[in-house]
């Protein structure tokens, strides 16, 4: 699976959208998790609702919420009152059973608000020293990730 | 009308291969998982594993993973089960099923094959 | 993996009576992802019940499912000669998905 990056500005609301093929994920449910370390497991943040046919609904745990429309094959998570910490890598996960499928790697970067003079030096941006210029942007907050690219911040 | 035909009875020896074939029709094929489910002589249903024909991702159950092999010619609208070494223990009836997927929402089979009846013996 | 407990292994009853099939599960199953499935001899499964209590296409509003979490019924309210048979639930919550061990329905 390739990473996509959605990039969003601290304090503000992210969406993250994660397209599937709707007729071979009919009928399982969905999840959000968030990748512990590069081969760590990914830790369930939030998932679909327990009945498949009320999947439209958004459910949230804290500030993450997801909603799934299983006919148009599109699984968007929200991300609230986006905060440095949030950056990171993650998966959206169709449900087979106990077991699941990745439908999308997301790498979340979280940038400075302008509007914020505190020290952005807490603010993690994976991969910076590398060049985005020709990196495929959705809806100007995502990209594709690049080859090379470090989807973990170096550990010291 | 929906359907799924499977291929005929066989006797075999054990050692050898055999593959049986379950074919589809009066749907799309390839818009639903479908499952191999064993029934040993006399005894209950085992679900053996699935395969979502448009795209061959397959799924099995761990007392049958390495044990047998699961495939599909989506351009044929057929699905097949396979052993390459057979045992004794393999004599059973095998049905291939059909997820429900779209008509229910749901995952449970609601479309069955007739069975082939395996038989292995020296 | 989840273990299906169907009970009793063999209910004889005379036509015209109720039924009550019991599938008690060895975890927390969604009910979302329990079904029913009728056996006759020689002849494929077919399926009755989804999601614990929906009846399947052409099913006779005399069966019906109910339940939740580790324990499922399936209830034939009047039996009907062609409802003796062997009858199965089924659990998709988990994987690998599980099948209990049948209860049998015989004519008393």
């Known amino acids: 699976h390739n990473t996509t990056v959605f990039q969003g500005v601290a304090g503000q609301s992210l969406q993250v959208s994660c397209p599937y093929d709707s007729m071979k994920h009919w009928g399982r449910r969905k999840a959000w998790c968030r990748q512990l370390g590069e081969k760590g497991p990914c830790q369930r943040v939030v998932s679909t609702h327990n009945l498949w046919l009320l999947s439209f609904l958004r459910r949230w745990n804290g500030s993450t919420a997801i909603t799934d429309d299983t006919l148009g094959g599109t699984l968007t998570i929200t991300l609230r009152n986006l905060q440095p910490h949030d950056a990171g890598l993650y998966q959206c996960q169709s449900l087979h059973g106990s077991e699941a499928d990745t439908l999308r790697k997301v790498l979340v970067e979280v940038l400075a608000d302008p509007l914020d003079h505190r020290d952005a030096g807490d603010l993690w941006f994976p991969g910076e020293s590398e060049s985005f210029e020709d990196a495929h942007v959705e809806h100007s907050i995502s990209r594709s990730l690049l080859e090379g690219e470090i989807p973990f911040p170096p550990t010291s | 009308e929906v359907q799924l035909v499977q291929s005929g009875a066989e006797v075999k020896k054990p050692g050898e291969s055999l593959k049986i074939s379950c074919k589809g029709s009066?749907?799309?094929?390839?818009?639903?998982?479908i499952g191999w489910v064993r029934q040993m002589p006399g005894k209950g249903l085992e679900w053996m594993g699935i395969?979502?024909?448009?795209?061959?991702?397959?799924r099995y159950s761990p007392s049958f993973q390495g044990q047998v092999t699961i495939s599909a010619d989506k351009s044929i609208s057929t699905a097949y089960l396979q052993w390459s070494s057979l045992k004794a223990s393999d004599t059973a009836m095998y049905y291939c099923?059909?997820?429900?997927?779209?008509?229910?929402?749901?995952?449970?089979?609601?479309?069955w094959g007739q069975g082939t009846m395996v038989t292995v013996s020296s | 993996e989840i273990v299906l407990t169907q009970s009793p292994g063999t209910l004889s009853l005379s036509p015209g009576e109720r039924a009550t099939l019991s599938c008690r599960a060895s975890?927390?199953?969604?009910?979302?992802?329990l079904a029913w499935y009728q056996q006759k001899p020689g002849q494929a499964p077919r399926l009755l019940i989804y999601?614990?209590?929906s009846r399947a296409t052409g099913i006779p509003d005399r069966f019906s499912g109910s339940g939740s979490g580790t324990d499922f019924t399936l209830t034939i309210s009047r039996l009907e000669p062609e409802d003796f048979a062997v009858y199965y639930c089924?659990?998709?919550?988990?994987?690998?998905?599980?099948f209990g061990g049948g209860t049998k329905v015989e004519i008393k």
């Open positions: 089924q659990q998709h919550d988990s994987s690998p998905p599980t």
């Open positions: 395969i979502y024909p448009g795209d061959s991702d397959t």
């Open positions: 009066g749907y799309s094929f390839t818009s639903n998982w």
């Open positions: 999601g614990a209590s």
């Open positions: 975890q927390s199953v969604s009910s979302s992802y």
């Open positions: 099923a059909r997820e429900a997927g779209y008509d229910y929402g749901e995952l449970a089979f609601d479309i």
